[in-house]
Amino acid sequence: VRERGPQRVAAHITGTRGRSNTLSSPNSKNEKALGRKINSWESSRSGHSFLSNLHLRNGELVIQEKGFYYIYSQTYFRFQEEIKENTKNDKQMVQYIYKYTSYPDPILLMKSARNSCWSKDAEYGLYSIYQGGLFELKKDDRIFVSVTNEHLIDMDHEASFFGAFLVG
Amino acid sequence: VRERGPQRVAAHITGTRGRSNTLSSPNSKNEKALGRKINSWESSRSGHSFLSNLHLRNGELVIQEKGFYYIYSQTYFRFQEEIKENTKNDKQMVQYIYKYTSYPDPILLMKSARNSCWSKDAEYGLYSIYQGGLFELKKDDRIFVSVTNEHLIDMDHEASFFGAFLVG
Amino acid sequence: VRERGPQRVAAHITGTRGRSNTLSSPNSKNEKALGRKINSWESSRSGHSFLSNLHLRNGELVIQEKGFYYIYSQTYFRFQEEIKENTKNDKQMVQYIYKYTSYPDPILLMKSARNSCWSKDAEYGLYSIYQGGLFELKKDDRIFVSVTNEHLIDMDHEASFFGAFLVG
């Protein structure tokens, strides 16, 4: 069997709840990026998350080797009918995937959106958003995920995740 | 042109209807796995489904070579809404991707969910769920897809499918 | 660092608005393909879209090297709801991915669907559809995306895109 190990440039990082080392930094609401950056990713949960020739820093995957990467994320929005005055019944759930390069502002690579059910009879909502695409990245580029309505995200490791791998 | 063939470890298996060799086994409702396992996958429909250095057994893809795999599935839920005596039967449509290892219980890798429309005007629902992610798998690990509300799944080969490929 | 460049067979092409060189050709409504083919893809937007050992012709990615390809697309449907008397307001949003081979008719590889919200209270709809899968393609095969309700598609480059890469 051939040895593929050394060629591997890949990551799959997963949601985690309330871990003190992964709380949002004050800068998690980047004024130039839409939504709010997800910082609470876990990268070493056996059998579920890993980093291989990519680094994780402040919720961002940091590229070590230039090339074309398939980048993907899933975010699982979950909410219920709650008695709160002055709240619109509709929610826009948007997932953004950005990159930082040497250019100071983040660059939007992909966005995916859903709005919730408008019916007054709605009791709850379950909406997973997945997207992925191929992008050329350079050494030290950083990629991250941001979302609207971040308080609705279910950060179970099977439900919300972020990953990338080098293609070809 | 270089020869890539021998390096290929990949599969794309597709939904099939009522084929006797792919009907759910009595054990398709695994008590330790949420939902019901989909067994009715087809692996040799020309131009649509294939297995290359992966095996298919009882609806499960069986790993022949250890490594990081991008695993994905799409399931297409389709139904007529039935309003019975002013009761709305909201549907939670969840797709789970599990793996079996030497550990006796299946391990949940990914889950994606949608709920159906709450409006009383709803006549039918169309909901495709796609998810995918990177996971380290070992020889003889098995991966499978299970779903809630399996009777709602459209098992057309273009609509519901399951696949994996070795990365790097 | 090893040289991966020559091995790269990949593309990520992105939505574009009203560019004269990407307008639908008269044949974009292929009678044998469901939906309407999207022709307005951009392939050389720095940092966002590219072609590497694949060609783009009439909205179709043209294969240069046979092999197994992971093919994906995202289409972003966005619309205002219009309340018309006694008119059902439901929309079926379907994304199809087809291939052309030497066989004269296009062959459907994948389809993904959503219907819009039925509620009379609905004001607008946001629905991203992503799907992807692995398929064996031969030299000169062509792949394309078609959609129902194409006038609802948001062709921003981050929102709607189409891509493929050679696996293994």
């Epitope: 979950r78 219920q80 019944n89 007054k120 009879d121 709605a122 379950l126 | 009761t87 939670q92 009383k120 | -």
Partner: antibody, heavy 115, light 107 residues
Framework: EVQLVESGGGLVQPGGSLRLSCAAS????????MSWVRQAPGKRLEWVAT????????YYPDNLKGRFTISRDNAKNSLYLQMNSLRAEDTAVYYC????????WGQGTLVTVSS | DIQLTQSPSFLSASVGDRVTITCRAS??????LSWLQQKPGKTIKRLIY???TLDSGVPSRFSGSRSGSEYTLTISSLQPEDFATYYC?????????FGGGTKVEIK
């Protein structure tokens, strides 16, 4: 502040009927689903009925369907439970709760079915 | 119907103890589970919703968690006012179902 106040409980003979009311305040009543829950003496909580926010849907457990009817009057911010063909086993404290996930509860009203 | 199996049904503990109550769901409920506190003569109070979200005004010693189909209410350091009966409730589907309750008493 959300407030739910039940009324209408009391002593009733087996086979009789009773109508419970729940007066709601502190939120836009018509936007939210409402439920009735009961608790027999020394027993666990038991769900009785729910009506959706828009009033389109009503839900009951199978064992109460046909005997109990939930309704609402959004103009009066009121929820009702009509209970017919009452039995001794319907004896319980009846609570109204809002919304369908039962964030808020009333103090309850006692229904005693006895001859 | 979805069954909620709550355990233990009775718990004797001292002030300052860490207390754990579990609730197992027989089917997927997507985290739509809440924990309620009932004290004699008082209005029933919701403590936790969506499996792990603390209601406003509820002390931080209460927490909820989920592992698959098992849901847990934890009181990190039991206080005198916490002696009560606790119920889990699933609101993912109809019929709504409650756990059997856990009575927490002073040792």
């Amino acid at each position: 502040e959300v407030q739910l106040v039940e009324s209408g409980g009391g002593l009733v003979q087996p086979g009789g009927s009773l109508r419970l009311s729940c007066a709601a305040s502190g939120f836009t009543f018509s936007n939210y689903g409402m439920s009735w829950v009961r608790q027999a003496p020394g027993k666990r909580l038991e769900w009785v009925a729910t009506i959706s926010g828009g009033g389109s849907y009503t839900y009951y457990p199978d064992n109460l369907k046909g005997r109990f009817t939930i309704s609402r009057d959004n103009a009066k911010n009121s929820l009702y439970l009509q209970m017919n063909s009452l039995r001794a086993e319907d004896t319980a404290v009846y609570y109204c709760a809002a919304p369908t996930a039962m964030d808020y509860w009333g103090q309850g009203t006692l229904v005693t079915v006895s001859s | 119907d979805i069954q909620l199996t709550q355990s233990p049904s009775f718990l004797s503990a001292s002030v300052g103890d860490r207390v754990t109550i579990t609730c197992r769901a027989s089917q997927e409920i997507s985290g739509f589970l809440s924990w309620l506190q009932q004290k004699p003569g008082k209005t029933i109070k919701r403590l936790i919703y969506a499996a792990s979200t603390l209601d406003s005004g509820v002390p931080s010693r209460f927490s909820g968690s989920r592992s698959g189909s098992e849901y847990t209410l934890t009181i990190s350091s039991l206080q005198p006012e916490d002696f009560a009966t606790y119920y889990c409730l699933q609101y993912a589907s109809y019929p709504r179902t409650f756990g059997g309750g856990t009575k927490v008493e002073i040792k």
